[in-house]
Interface confidence: low
């Protein structure tokens, strides 16, 4: 009540919305044929939908996405020396989210 | 460079810092002995350390944490009717982060 303070505050639902997440840039995204390189930066921020919906039959999903190309450094080791090259990785940002009904397929009888 | 703009922007490292994440409140946290209830809200926001460090030998870890008790509703089904009870769940928020050396134990020879 007003004027009283409980030690434990009421838990507030994490609503379905975009939040900043960390995306690991895997080497596979840049070159599947060669393992002899590093990627810089190793991770970037992306916007992703997360949170809960009102019941278990609906899930928080992206309703609008945007692809964002970014340049990364591909650091190849050539004759024991680092050679710095460039590569483009396309990130997926979620722009809007909604609670969407999850249609679970009926088991085949 | 300053004053220049390319179609693909340089990727910016997701630095090691606290970000808002969604924490699913599992029923185990409230009652391990009984499965016949629901929890509301099903998820809450917490602050967690995430991001990358400058090399693979260091990891982004919490350097300061705070426990935060929150009240949730435990909705028990008693004789087909919902009974609302209260329960306390303790959440862990990360207040500060640092890039910490990962000590990998040497293999026993």
């Amino acid at each position: 009540s007003l004027g009283s303070l409980a030690a434990a505050e009421p838990a507030v639902i994490a609503e379905c919305k975009t939040r900043t997440e960390v995306f690991q840039i895997s080497r596979n995204l840049i070159d599947r044929t060669n393992a002899n390189f590093l990627v810089w930066p190793p991770c970037v921020e992306v916007q992703r939908c997360s949170g809960c919906c009102n019941n278990r039959n609906v899930q928080c999903r992206a309703s609008q996405v945007q692809m964002r190309p970014v340049q990364v450094r591909k650091i190849e080791i050539v004759r024991k020396k680092p050679v710095f090259k460039k590569a483009t990785v396309t990130l997926e940002d979620h722009l809007a989210c909604k609670c969407e009904t999850v249609v679970t397929p009926r088991p085949v009888t | 460079s300053l004053g220049s703009l390319a179609a693909a922007e340089p990727a910016v490292i997701a630095e090691c810092k606290t970000r808002t994440e969604v924490f699913q409140i599992s029923r185990n946290l409230i009652d391990r002995t009984n499965a016949n209830f629901l929890v509301w809200p099903p998820c809450v926001e917490v602050q967690r350390c995430s991001g990358c460090c400058n090399n693979r030998n260091v990891q982004c870890r919490a350097s300061q944490v705070q426990m935060r008790p929150v009240q949730v509703r435990k909705i028990e089904i008693v004789r087909k009717k919902p009974v609302f009870k209260k329960a306390t769940v303790t959440l862990e928020d990360h207040l500060a982060c640092k890039c910490e050396t990962v000590v990998t134990p040497r293999p026993v020879t």
């Epitope: 930066p41 090259k85 460039k86 | 220049s4 390319a6 910016v12």
Partner: antibody, heavy 120, light 107 residues
Framework: EVQLVESGGGLVQPGGSLRLSCAAS????????MSWVRQAPEKGLEWVST????????YYADSVKGRFTISRDNAKNSLYLQMNSLRAEDTAVYYC?????????????WGQGTLVTVSS | DIQMTQSPSSLSASVGDRVAITCRAS??????LNWYQQKPGKAPKLLIY???SLQSGVPSRFSGSGSGTDFTLTISSLQPEDFATYYC?????????FGGGTKVEIK
């Protein structure tokens, strides 16, 4: 207005050392990669070294590797080049330059340069 | 290492002329090519980055084109202040390398 001002050049004997400084102003120094580029008298431009915004990544031309060290102090908005075991062929005007972000690798803004003369 | 070859090494032209300078890379560098102008006793100045993007504050008479190994810097109508030495530079991989320069002189 972006300004880069180099200092520390001068006459030095072969085998000697010199430390160049570059004072930056007019932009967020700590957000930009920085480089040193040199130009021998009546010659073309030669890239020397580059350092990342935070100072954690450095790389060098083969001609200076093991002898020169690039560093920075973001609190002081300053870039440095420590030059050891100097040779006659290191004689040049040394420019500091802003090199953009992770993937730019160009030289957007330049200082006026400082002359290093290696001679006995 | 990627070698950058500029041609011609020098040229004479008059005010108002259209001038083209070429730069060739020893291997494909996509569009990671930059152009600089340097006047005697002065620091170089960035003109064009990413082969064709005009750096802020640079007059529109300067333009860049090309991709892969062959690139061109064009000055559509040469002005008195354009007499200088021009350098290309690849930013595809380290070591970063410059062309030998092209000196544009008054005819």
């Amino acid at each position: 207005e972006v300004q880069l001002v180099e200092s520390g050049g001068g006459l030095v004997q072969p085998g000697g050392s010199l430390r160049l400084s570059c004072a930056a102003s007019g932009f967020t120094f700590s957000s930009y990669w920085m480089s040193w580029v040199r130009q021998a008298p009546e010659k073309g431009l030669e890239w020397v070294s580059t350092i990342s915004d935070g100072g954690g990544l450095t790389y060098y031309a083969d001609s200076v590797k093991g002898r020169f060290t690039i560093s920075r102090d973001n609190a002081k908005n300053s870039l440095y080049l420590q030059m050891n075991s100097l040779r006659a062929e290191d004689t040049a005007v040394y420019y500091c330059a802003e090199s953009g972000g992770y993937t730019d690798w160009l030289f957007g803004y330049w200082g006026q340069g400082t002359l290093v003369t290696v001679s006995s | 290492d990627i070698q950058m070859t500029q041609s011609p090494s020098s040229l004479s032209a008059s005010v108002g002329d259209r001038v083209a300078i070429t730069c060739r890379a020893s291997q494909s560098i996509s569009n990671y090519l930059n152009w600089y102008q340097q006047k005697p006793g002065k620091a170089p100045k960035l003109l064009i980055y990413a082969a064709s993007s005009l750096q802020s504050g640079v007059p529109s008479r300067f333009s860049g084109s090309g991709s892969g190994t062959d690139f061109t810097l064009t000055i559509s109508s040469l002005q008195p202040e354009d007499f200088a030495t021009y350098y290309c530079q690849q930013s595809y991989s380290t070591p970063l390398t410059f062309g030998g320069g092209t000196k544009v002189e008054i005819k």
